[in-house]
Interface confidence: medium
Amino acid sequence: SLGSLAAAEPAVIAECKTRTEVFQISRNLIDRTNANFLVWPPCVEVQRCSGCCNNRNVQCRASQVQMRPVQVRKIEIVRKKPVFKKATVTLEDHLACKCETVVTPRPVT
Amino acid sequence: SLGSLAAAEPAVIAECKTRTEVFQISRNLIDRTNANFLVWPPCVEVQRCSGCCNNRNVQCRASQVQMRPVQVRKIEIVRKKPVFKKATVTLEDHLACKCETVVTPRPVT
């Protein structure tokens, strides 16, 4: 709304940089062939680029990426009882970000 | 996969807490009747609850919320020229989080 301007602070742009985000570990990252298991932990923290750039034609993108393998528990249910195994999930952390020009494909004439 | 376990660190759960997120300021937050304008900044930082809980039947939810009005620029295009106005957008910050029981509705028999 256009009202109550007095108490409002000027909005500050969320700059393009890495921030901590929560990544949900989906089961198909571990085993696509079997649904009879659980994963623990269900979510982990990752570093991801986010924010806005000063120009409409650029987007905040990762300029440097690192892959980080982590061990999770794969809790298989065998005859109604759990079997705990380790599985490795590779997470993607963004180390640096930049405002990158977005190339919009021109329509074919 | 279950391979290459040696180099992987045990995954740490992303605990239920407030984290900094990027909120996109959509134009309809400012004016639903008119699309002929731009907003600056296009995004801001907010505090939001995220993460996972130790229990299957609970979810990470905000237990304390604060509304924060901020001033943005509404850049109207009038006769192909920009007219700068102020507008207020009210952001929602999460101040505290808790793992809250999710009541799953039982099927009607």
Epitope: Q71, K81, P82, V83 | P10, N55, V58
Partner: antibody
């Protein structure tokens, strides 16, 4: 204070029964899986039984299967171990312990232990 | 049934490094936890998930696990570290404990 307070141990004759209790305080009991672990005099630790946060999953060591029953009352923040058909080899200090997750995991909090002696 | 094997005893001089091993078939495929127990006391968790240290546990305690062997390492061992140590792993629907290792701090 986060703690587990045990009670119910004592002397019992072979073939007899006993019920151990473990009262939890200082944390949300209903969010944690629990286990019973025992230790015979001068011996090592032996896992006895496990129960999930909501009581839906229960597991037992082969040595106690069919004789011991684990249960919990989340409204009373209490864990139980009903021990029937007791044998001399069940003589041990029994510990209740907390798992940090609903499915189990490490035992991050232990009770003070209670001695069960099976003897005629 | 699954078995975890530990040496019955390990001796170390104060300030030296103590290593306690725990072996089992494909143990590296499971998460291993370590417990310390002093005479007349309840066990205390010192390492979980192979290598994580609970809050309040000194940094001199560390752990590793690969292949068939998990190891608890105590660097700069102190007299107060003298205790029984048990490894544990949750395998096929049961928590299995090793037989325990008595750590003696000499002197």
């Amino acid at each position: 204070e986060v703690q587990l307070l045990q009670s119910g141990g004592g002397l019992v004759k072979p073939g007899g029964s006993l019920r151990l209790s473990c009262a939890a305080s200082g944390f949300t009991f209903s969010s944690y899986a629990m286990s019973w672990v025992r230790q015979a005099p001068g011996k090592g630790l032996e896992w006895v039984s496990y129960i999930s946060d909501d009581g839906s999953l229960k597991y037992y060591a082969d040595s106690v299967k069919g004789r011991f029953t684990i249960s919990r009352d989340n409204s009373k923040n209490t864990l139980y171990l009903q021990m029937n058909s007791l044998r001399a080899e069940d003589t041990a200090v029994y510990y209740c312990a907390r798992h940090p997750y609903w499915y189990g995991g490490q035992l991050d909090l232990w009770g003070q232990g209670t001695l069960v002696t099976v003897s005629s | 049934s699954y078995e975890l094997t530990q040496p019955p005893s390990v001796s170390v001089s104060p300030g030296q490094t103590a290593s306690i091993t725990c072996s089992g078939d494909s143990l590296g495929s499971y998460f291993v936890h370590w417990y310390q127990q002093k005479p007349g006391q309840s066990p205390v968790l010192v390492i979980y998930d192979d290598s994580k240290r609970p809050s309040g546990i000194p940094e001199r305690f560390s752990g590793s696990n690969s292949g068939n062997t998990a190891t608890l390492t105590i660097s700069g061992t102190q007299a107060m570290d003298e205790a029984d140590y048990y490894c544990s792993a949750f395998t096929h629907n049961s928590d299995v404990f090793g037989g325990g290792t008595k750590l003696t701090v000499l002197g």
